[in-house]
């Protein structure tokens, strides 16, 4: 697989440099802040129930827009622009992963407390699906981690 990775890395690098992932960061930050507001949760509280409604992927914040579909109906401006940018990575799952990791790295300093960080990661992992795109099976979104290799 090395030759693919070398070719792919170069192509991916230029795609990442061209992409404007800022709308994705804004969309996700707005979403987790809106969730906190609508459920009256304290982002600093360490004793939050990890299965509270706003974190259940099957239950959405009633005030948030529906997941983006390609017609753009009812979606936020940030989300629509974000999906357009992510669409550039849809045929390269490694590059999609790198884009998600870049979003995580760019926002990690702005996330307040472990609770908010976990929520941001969860929303970030769901982002490709919200855009009607296929997500890689697993993206390591730990900002300072070497990850784990299975092989």
């Amino acid at each position: 697989r090395q030759q693919w990775e070398l070719q792919g890395d170069r192509r991916c690098q230029s795609q990442l440099e061209r992409a404007n992932l800022r709308p994705c960061e804004q969309h996700l930050m707005q979403k987790i802040q809106r969730d906190e507001d609508s459920y009256g949760r304290d982002p600093y509280s360490p004793s939050q129930d990890p299965y509270s409604p706003s974190q259940d992927p099957d239950r959405r914040d009633p005030y948030s827009p529906s997941p983006y579909d390609r017609r753009g109906a009812g979606s936020s401006q940030h989300q629509e622009r974000c999906c357009n940018e992510l669409n550039e990575f849809e045929n390269n799952q490694r590059c999609m992963c790198e884009a998600l990791q870049q979003i995580m790295e760019n926002q990690s300093d702005r996330l307040q407390g472990r609770q908010q960080e976990q929520q941001f990661k969860r929303e970030l992992r769901n982002l490709p699906q919200q855009c009607g795109l296929r997500a890689p099976q697993r993206c390591d979104l730990e900002v300072e981690s070497g990850g784990r290799d299975r092989y």
């Epitope: 992963c97 890689p136 290799d149 092989y151």
Partner: antibody
């Protein structure tokens, strides 16, 4: 040796339900995604659904979305495909297929369909 | 979705002849995500070529894959009796789709 065995096929009336099961052996089951692929009699191959290695990601083909449900039990090395509201055009041999995914640096990517079961025939007929 | 179109639909050849099967994608894909399968009557498909040009374990070297972008080719340099079967290309760059198949039959 990698082995995938499907069961549960049979004849069913339109609108009814049927469940298929795939039992895997010969590899570390919870490292691999599993797909279902079907083939109508005399026709080509059609991807149906997939469940990721940890069960966190599930996708369906548009033709079965909302009617079929894929799940896995890593403790039993099984993947199930629950098929509801069956239609005549669901008639096919259903194959359980291992995704030869590739993991690196904590990331795991979809891979080739490297091992297939022998298939289970589902016939939807009045 | 990416549509794969295989040609010809049927290829009638004699043992010992060279077979050239084509697979065209509706949009450009990395060769990493292109595979070829062989299917014989009453059997499950078998992985033949992955990454457009790599033979899977146990596949004889008379099978070879090539191509890039939107055009991919499977070549069987000299047909053996056991090679008469249906061949499918498949992509997994963007979801998962198969070509409609090419049947290689005895002339």
């Amino acid at each position: 040796q990698v082995h995938l065995v499907e069961s549960g096929g049979g004849v069913v009336q339109p609108g009814r339900s049927l469940g298929l099961s795939c039992v895997a052996s010969g590899f570390t089951f919870n490292y691999y995604a599993i797909h279902w692929v079907r083939q109508a009699p005399g026709k080509g191959l059609e991807w149906v659904a997939v469940v990721s290695f940890d069960g966190n990601i599930i996708y369906y083909a548009d033709s079965v979305k909302g009617r079929f449900n894929i799940s896995r039990d890593n403790s039993k090395n099984t993947v199930n495909l629950q098929m509801n509201s069956l239609r005549p055009d669901d008639t096919a041999v259903y194959y359980c297929v291992r995704d030869g995914e590739y993991c690196s640096g904590g990331n795991c990517y979809w891979g080739d369909f490297d091992h297939w079961g022998q298939g289970s025939l589902v016939t939807v007929s009045p | 979705e990416i549509v794969l179109t295989q040609s010809p639909a049927t290829l009638s050849l004699s043992p010992g002849e060279r077979a050239t099967l084509s697979c065209r994608a509706s949009q450009s894909i990395s060769s990493e995500y292109l595979t070829w399968f062989q299917q014989k009557p009453g059997q499950a498909p078998r992985l033949l070529i992955y990454g457009a040009f790599n033979r899977a374990t146990g596949i004889p070297d008379r099978f070879s894959g090539s191509g890039s972008g939107t055009d991919f080719t499977l070549t069987i340099s000299s047909l053996e009796p056991e090679d008469f079967a249906v061949y499918y290309c498949q992509q997994y760059a963007n979801w998962w789709t198969f070509g409609q198949g090419t049947k290689v039959e005895i002339k």
